[in-house]
């Protein structure tokens, strides 16, 4: 499917002191959706500032956000999910800045979980598996996953593999023997919905065997 912006591109804000960005999460709490917005400048004095969303809503014209420390948050079933909503920063009744946003283009999936790695001695490979709550969802079901792994001593030398399933095989010969590895995974919408990368899953650590050394399941460290 063609799109206009790369996945992960933030909506650009108006050039003023109240620039903000938002992300949506669909069916994040049962059938409830959420929308989270925050100012891009952490030094903005948010004391009297409120957020409001209007348009592309079911049964209501507008909804107000709740303030949770530095973020603004809505949890609701009332997103129409078609058409553009107008999200405004307000002081009282006055709008300081607004953005037209289609909530289906700013979706941030939930982080994958239960990441694990199993060594298969006979096949000389590692089977990486993980889980995602999106397998049970009705809207954002199709994701692209980014599995990243590195040798623990190579701080910034991550190898990335993109896949659409929740299972990946790493060949032993592609990894250093007797080395400690860190692996993690994140997800991004991949069919119709667009948006941002999820948070990373918790990292999993595993050690590769010595050459010709047999080993069973990789134990987490």
């Amino acid at each position: 499917e063609s799109g206009y912006a790369q996945n992960g591109d933030l909506e650009d804000a108006e050039l003023d002191d109240y620039s903000f960005s938002c992300y949506s999460q669909l069916e994040v709490n049962g059938s409830q959706h959420s929308l989270t917005c925050a100012f891009e400048d952490p030094d903005v004095n948010i004391t009297n500032l409120e957020f409001e969303i209007c348009g592309a809503l079911v049964e209501v014209k507008c909804l107000n956000f709740r303030k949770l420390q530095e973020i603004y948050f809505i949890e609701t079933k009332k997103f129409l999910l078609i058409g553009k909503s107008n999200i405004c920063v307000k002081v009282g009744e006055k709008s300081l800045t607004c953005k037209k946003i289609d909530l289906t283009t700013i979706v941030k999936p939930e982080a994958p979980f239960d990441l694990s790695v199993v060594y298969r001695e006979g096949a000389n490979d590692f089977v990486v598996t993980f889980n995602t709550s999106h397998l049970q969802k009705k809207y954002v079901k199709v994701l692209m996953h980014d599995v990243a792994y590195r040798q623990e001593k190579d701080e910034n030398k991550w190898t990335h593999v993109n896949l659409s399933s929740t299972k990946l095989t790493l060949l032993q010969r592609k990894l250093q023997p007797a080395a400690m590895y860190e692996i993690k995974v994140r997800s991004i919408p991949d069919h119709y919905f667009k948006g941002f990368w999820s948070e990373w899953s918790p990292s999993y650590y595993f050690r590769t065997p010595e050459i010709n050394n047999s080993s069973g399941e990789m134990d987490p460290i």
Epitope: E1, D9, D12, L81, I82, K84, K100, Y139, Y192
Partner: antibody, heavy 118, light 111 residues
Framework: QVQLVQSGAEVKKPGASVKVSCKAS????????LHWVRQAPGQGLEWMGG????????AYNQKFKGKVTLTSDRSTSTVYMELSSLRSEDTAVYYC???????????WGQGTTVTVSS | DIVLTQSPASLAVSPGQRATITCRTS??????????MHWYQQKPGQPPKLLIY???NLESGVPARFSGSGSETDFTLTINPVEAEDTANYYC?????????FGGGTKVEIK
Amino acid sequence: QVQLVQSGAEVKKPGASVKVSCKASGYRFTDYELHWVRQAPGQGLEWMGGIDPKTGGTAYNQKFKGKVTLTSDRSTSTVYMELSSLRSEDTAVYYCARSGGRWYFDVWGQGTTVTVSS
Amino acid sequence: DIVLTQSPASLAVSPGQRATITCRTSESVSIHLLHLMHWYQQKPGQPPKLLIYGASNLESGVPARFSGSGSETDFTLTINPVEAEDTANYYCQQSIKDPYTFGGGTKVEIK
């Protein structure tokens, strides 16, 4: 009020190019993507492609890739559609249309007739 | 490409009666309750006009005698009651997958 005003009718020879403009008014230009839809004489509607005036990013119907180039000018709130290597089959009314959501068209220009004839 | 088949190709309706147009798609254009089907009216010499978006949402300013329904691969546009000014061509359009395709159109005439 929200309006899309297109440039006037064009008559072109086969092999030539044509550039049709669509000027938006009555709303913030960068808030909505603009698309082009063509309608050959007595025929139905065919989506050609769209452009996001905010980023300049484009999306094309594969059928029209290489044939159509979409551009936008934020300073004048105008989008352009250039058709190259014109053939008689390109004779049609070309509409620009605003995308109210993904991807339906809530505001339409009046249409520009392009006639390709030797 | 997703193919949209409209039926009937044309119909004649008396004022005050109901007109029903169907649009069938070659694959589903729904994601759960999000139905990516839209309807337009086009009168001779004019651009199309959006009537219904998301299968059943009435566009602002469109008379309530127009309504839409359906999901997955089968959608319906209903005009009830039909008025003389509803003489036009009607098109369905899907937006789940590029290229965004239209149906072949249904010509509605008022008897």
